[in-house]
């Protein structure tokens, strides 16, 4: 299973649940679906307080039990360790996959934790940030901003990622902005 | 009590193909994930491939992934095995499992031989 | 491909305890809870032993007991017996290639 890491903003506005947790349990996997699920204890949510509605705490989060079908396994034994986590509603309860989100609180920089809490939801309605995988690449709308990060340093945790977001600028016009700037 | 009876197996020449059943028993079979197992003459015991109770997700080990089809029928309670492109290599007993493998058959042998 | 490691044999006297290890990674044994053991007479299928690491299938004698530590998990059998006298495997979840087998051990009863 392969996919290209999106950028965090991209992540927060295509995710149904975004929350901040500690992976608490031993994975168990249902003897019936395959599907593994970990034991979570959710500390903070960024996104998703109007599709849970009021069952407002997420104990478990589930993904497939095999890396070949996009499973995602969590490697950390630190049980104290809080992780962003980006995921999928279905049949409320939280899916993540391989090609989700899941990044250690910590790893983020000080941008991201202020676009996660606050400033990425900004640019969900309007805004797409468009990866630029080969050259050359174009703008298709005023509404994109191109993301080179992989393209020029060969990761996604390059500096679009880690300290810009695409957000409007006026109408139908989106740009990268800082969010250095933004944090108080 | 779980029951399950593996069919299908015999023998068959180097890029021939063999379908296995097993026809399970004493269980609500759609509740279970089922996998096939098999066992070389002599040798240790290999998983092959595994499918979700409702069929949607499949695993198969890299040794027969392209050539190895599994499948259910939940109606008949009957778990399958397709299997093409058959090489020597592949003689084995073939097992059928439940779940993360708490229930065995007996097995059937595969012999690919000409 | 072997993917968890065991001893290839192992003997004891009736009435001695004997324990087989079973050796995997982080991604099978050491990470979950689902380590299972298998004895297996000649020309029989495997039979179910212990499950889960510890738990005893009903109708199995409590002389075998399973436990795990770390990335090892092992299989214990006390007051042998001359049925006993087998192949033993075990067998676990894996992340990546979904269930995987040790190469099985096996055991003498010796006398």
């Known amino acids: 299973c392969t996919c290209v890491p999106p950028h965090p903003q991209t992540a927060f506005c295509n995710s149904d649940l975004v929350i901040r947790a500690k992976f608490v349990g031993t994975p168990e996997v249902n003897q019936t679906t395959l599907y593994q699920r970990y034991e979570i204890k959710m500390t903070k949510m960024y996104k998703g307080f109007q599709a849970l509605g009021d069952a407002a705490d997420i104990r478990f989060v589930y993904t497939p039990a095999m890396e070949s079908v996009c499973g995602y396994f969590h490697r950390s034994h630190n049980r104290s360790e809080e992780f962003l986590i980006a995921g999928k509603l279905q049949d409320g309860l939280l899916h993540i996959t391989t090609c989700s989100f899941v990044a250690p609180w910590n790893s983020l920089s000080l941008a991201q934790r202020r676009g996660f809490t606050k400033t990425y939801t900004v640019g969900c309605e309007e805004c797409t940030v468009f990866p630029c995988l080969s050259i050359p690449c174009k703008l298709q709308s005023g509404t994109h901003c191109l993301w080179t990060d992989q393209l020029l340093q060969g990761s996604e945790k390059g500096f679009q990622s880690r300290h810009l977001a695409c957000l409007p600028r006026e109408p139908g016009l989106c740009t990268w902005q800082s969010l250095r700037s933004q944090i108080a | 009590q779980v029951q399950l009876v593996e069919s299908g197996g015999g023998l068959v020449q180097p890029g021939g193909s063999l379908r296995l059943s097993c026809a399970a028993s004493g269980f609500t079979f759609s509740s279970y994930a089922m996998s096939w197992v098999r066992q070389a003459p002599g040798k240790g015991l290999e998983w092959v491939s595994g499918i979700s109770g409702n069929g949607v997700l499949i695993f198969y080990a890299d040794s027969v992934k392209g050539r190895f089809t599994i499948s259910r029928d939940n109606s008949k309670n009957t778990l399958y095995l397709q299997m093409n492109s058959l090489r020597a290599e592949d003689t084995a007993v073939y097992y059928c499992?439940?779940?993360?493998?708490?229930?065995w058959g007996q097995g059937t042998l595969v012999t690919v031989s000409s | 491909d072997i993917a968890l490691t065991q001893p290839a044999s192992v003997s004891g006297s009736p009435g001695q305890s004997i324990t087989i290890s079973c050796t995997g990674t982080s991604s099978d044994v050491g990470g979950y809870n689902y380590v299972s053991w298998y004895q297996q007479h000649p020309g029989k299928a495997p039979k179910l032993m212990i499950y889960?690491?510890?738990n005893r299938p009903s109708g199995v004698s409590n002389r075998f007991s399973g436990s795990k530590s770390g990335n090892t998990a092992s299989l214990t059998i006390s007051g042998l017996q001359a049925e006993d006298e087998a192949d033993y495997y075990c067998q676990s979840y894996d992340f990546v290639r979904f269930m995987v087998f040790g190469g099985g051990t096996k055991l003498t009863v010796l006398g």
């Open positions: 499992a439940r779940g993360l493998m708490d229930y």
């Open positions: 889960d690491v510890s």
